[in-house]
């Protein structure tokens, strides 16, 4: 067993005229991802035939947006290696297919738009355990630079990963089913660097940073001895190590997780974290692919050009998670404004608006005049996102629902007496004062302290009648404007109320469906 590793160094326009400026189409930004497919032997196989040695899909690269004036650079690539695990011997000769895919991000609402930008196919000879091999390949107008290697996973070694080895000091380990351990060669290549503190005597690792225990030892660093000796006969002590005792209480001893899964201890048991493409209690079930239908809720499964490659799910609106298995709580984004109630109906969102607001997201402010009409002949006045009622004489309060005593505010100045009247109030002024509110003193010479009239507008001036007529016309125009405003507002209310009733009916229908 082992791993084929591919490192993409750069992907960009090749040299020479006619090189593309951007991998993206005119529809906007895009990002790249790569797919590697391995086939045994050197035969020229059709691209669609299965990737018998394995396949892998990279993560998505960073978003690329073309700069109009800048020269086309090497494009931003996904991080990390592409790794293709192989279970059997490494064949030595193989076909390497690398595909560069473009994912367009112009409009994600309708799902991804992706297309194959370039495909390179190379037939190669490669020994496992050797150094990185570098290559540059052209695919149409594009150029791809990459390195690759095959490496064995301990205890396998050799150019085909068929020889088994162990550290010289390590005791024999038992295979599955408690059979005698397979004969192992004594020589080993330098082991990978294990987790810091991992016991040199009782621990080993197959991947850098891990610490796996030999029989008879347990604990995160393999320092804790299991109570019984590791290689006693099953039916009592035996001079020959023909059998092994069942591993001790450490549930992760000997790592029960297959296919590169990592084991973590849980109370009285263990849990395997499987690498992408494997599942099952011990990661023993071969890779999940698009052929398993892993994308729930109508997600699109993207797996390159054959059913046996790794997969990625593109989720339709309302779903998320690596398998589109989680419903997005779209109401958590608080799409309904002005205190509207959000309802997620699955295929759509609905906002139930508070009185005074309307629209799909309750974005239209009706200034509350809809739900709180002014009573007793009052008129609703808009302004500043709030409503105000201008009440008819004799009424007051927020909605003109309260009877008002017009004399309560003592409107008559200078000791004038207030009399309530059906049309308002009347002030009887104290001697020496005049005016509607007794606000003007009367001078001894009989002339009131009224503001002086402009020249040419003295009492009895012939122009006076004309000015009065103009004022009357202006007042009538203002009154007419207010009437028109009130009528149009009432029509608007009726329209929104009708729409709201219709929307509520639809909402009930959808919720009951």
């Amino acid at each position: 067993a082992g791993v084929f590793e591919l490192q993409i160094h750069s992907f960009g326009p090749g040299p020479g005229p006619g090189a593309p400026r951007s991998p993206c189409s005119a529809r906007g930004p895009c990002r790249l991802f790569f797919r590697v497919c391995l086939k045994p032997g050197l035969s020229e196989e059709a691209a669609e035939s299965p990737c018998a040695l394995g396949a892998a899909l990279s993560a998505r690269g960073p978003v690329y947006t073309e700069q109009p004036e800048a020269p086309a650079p090497d494009l931003p690539l996904p991080n990390g290696l592409l790794q293709v695990p192989f279970r059997d011997a490494w064949p030595g000769t193989f076909s390497l297919i690398i595909e560069t895919w473009r994912e367009e991000l112009g409009d994600q609402i309708g799902g991804p738009a992706w297309s194959l930008l370039a495909r390179v196919t190379r037939r190669r000879r490669l020994a496992a355990g050797g150094p990185w091999a570098r290559d540059i390949q052209r695919a149409g107008a594009w150029e791809l630079r990459f390195s690759y290697r095959a490496r064995c996973e301990l205890p396998a070694v050799g150019t085909a990963c068929t020889r088994l080895c162990r550290p010289r000091s390590a005791p024999s380990r038992c295979g599955p089913g408690l059979r005698p351990c397979a004969p192992l060669e004594d020589e080993c290549e330098a082991p990978p660097v294990c987790r810091a503190g991992c016991s040199l005597e009782h621990g080993f690792c197959e991947q850098p940073g891990e610490c796996r225990c030999l029989e008879g030892w347990t604990g995160p660093l393999c320092m804790v001895p299991v109570s019984t000796s590791s290689c006693l006969g099953l039916r009592g002590p035996s001079s020959t190590t023909t059998g092994c005792l069942v591993p001790g209480p450490g549930p992760c001893d000997g790592n029960p997780c297959a296919n590169g899964g990592s084991c973590s201890e849980t109370p009285g048991s263990f849990e395997c974290t499987c690498p992408r493409g494997f599942y099952g209690l011990r990661c023993e079930v071969s890779g999940v692919t698009c052929a398993d239908g892993p994308c729930f809720n109508g997600g699109l499964c993207v797996g390159g050009a054959d059913p046996d490659s790794a997969y990625i799910c593109h989720c339709p609106p309302g779903f998320q998670g690596s398998n589109c298995e989680k419903r997005v709580d779209r109401c958590s984004l608080q799409p309904c404004r002005n205190g509207g109630l959000c309802l997620d109906l699955g295929h759509a969102l609905r906002c139930r608006c508070r009185a005074g607001f309307a629209g799909p997201r309750c974005e239209h402010d009706l200034d509350d005049c809809a739900g709180r009409a002014c009573a007793n002949g009052g008129t609703c006045v808009e302004g500043g996102g709030a409503h105000r009622c201008s009440c008819a004489l004799g009424f007051g309060g927020r909605n003109c629902r309260e009877r008002a005593d017009p004399c309560a505010a003592r409107p008559c100045a200078h000791g004038g007496r207030c009399y309530a009247h059906f049309s308002g109030l009347v002030c009887a002024c104290a001697p020496g004062y005049m005016g509607a509110r007794c606000e003007f003193p009367v001078h001894p010479d009989g002339v009131s302290a009224l503001p002086a009239a402009p020249p040419g507008l003295r009492p009895g001036d012939p122009q006076r009648a004309g000015v009065i007529a103009v004022i009357v016309v202006v007042v009538i125009a203002i009154v007419a404007g207010i009437v028109v405003l009130v009528i149009s507002r009432k029509k608007r209310m009726a329209k929104y109320e009708k729409a709201e009733i219709k929307e509520m009916g639809e909402m009930h229908r959808e919720l009951n469906a």
Partner: antibody, heavy 120, light 107 residues
Framework: QVQLQQSGAELARPGASMKLSCKAS????????ISWVKQITGQGLEWIGE????????YDNENFRGKATLTADKSSSTAYLEVRSLTSEDSAVYFC?????????????WGQGTTLTVSS | DIQMTQSPASLSVSVGETVTITCRAS??????LAWYQQKQGKSPQLLVY???NLADGVPSRFSGSGSGTQFSLKISGLQSEDFGSYYC?????????FGGGTKLEIR
């Protein structure tokens, strides 16, 4: 060559159940999905659901939930559609179709169809 | 559910003419759309997938176009074997739905 061979025409009583079959040949059965489509005579097409034979996963149209059950037998490369509690509205031609498992999706091969008649 | 609206519902044309059938999705489905042809008493046949890609063995007189919500299937120089019904189908979110169909008849 790829073929989907469906079972013959069926006559059933209201309230009964009927299991229709679709035998695949000429390709790896577990590398594709099988979708089922209903067509009432003289009308359009309606997708019932899809099964992935490799895993047994099924995805269905909610309109057929409780009405249709999809299964598959890998050993015989056969997919099945069981229609329960039959009524006259279930009288239709039922097609099975091979479905790509990776996007872009499409139904590239169809069975010849099975006519189901529900009558008392 | 995404609704697929096909137009026209029926069309009467002569051999050699060019026809265009349209399909409108109620939501953006990008290019997740296929077209099928069905002849009387037969099963449907795939013509176009991913909105614009011609299926294997389909004559080049057929072409698909569109993206988002508006799609069309064009048949240039109709042949006698092209008469029948045509359906569009989306593949974006469940359930996958078909258009109501367009019946193409000989004039």
């Amino acid at each position: 060559q790829v073929q989907l061979q469906q079972s013959g025409a069926e006559l059933a009583r209201p309230g009964a159940s009927m299991k229709l079959s679709c035998k695949a040949s000429g390709y790896t059965f577990t590398s594709y999905g099988i979708s089922w489509v209903k067509q009432i005579t003289g009308q359009g097409l309606e997708w019932i659901g899809e099964i992935f034979p490799r895993s047994g996963n099924t995805y269905d149209n909610e309109n057929f939930r409780g009405k249709a059950t999809l299964t598959a037998d890998k050993s015989s490369s056969t997919a099945y559609l069981e229609v329960r509690s039959l009524t006259s509205e279930d009288s239709a031609v039922y097609f099975c179709a091979r479905t790509t498992v990776f996007a872009p999706y499409y139904f590239d091969y169809w069975g010849q169809g099975t006519t189901l008649t529900v009558s008392s | 559910d995404i609704q697929m609206t096909q137009s026209p519902a029926s069309l009467s044309v002569s051999v050699g003419e060019t026809v265009t059938i349209t399909c409108r999705a109620s939501e953006n489905i990008n290019s997740n759309l296929a077209w099928y042809q069905q002849k009387q008493g037969k099963s449907p046949q795939l013509l176009v997938y991913a909105a614009t890609n011609l299926a294997d063995g389909v004559p080049s007189r057929f072409s698909g176009s569109g993206s988002g919500t508006q799609f069309s299937l064009k048949i240039s120089g109709l042949q006698s074997e092209d008469f029948g019904s045509y359906y569009c189908q989306h593949f974006w979110g469940l359930p996958w739905t078909f258009g109501g169909g367009t019946k193409l008849e000989i004039r």
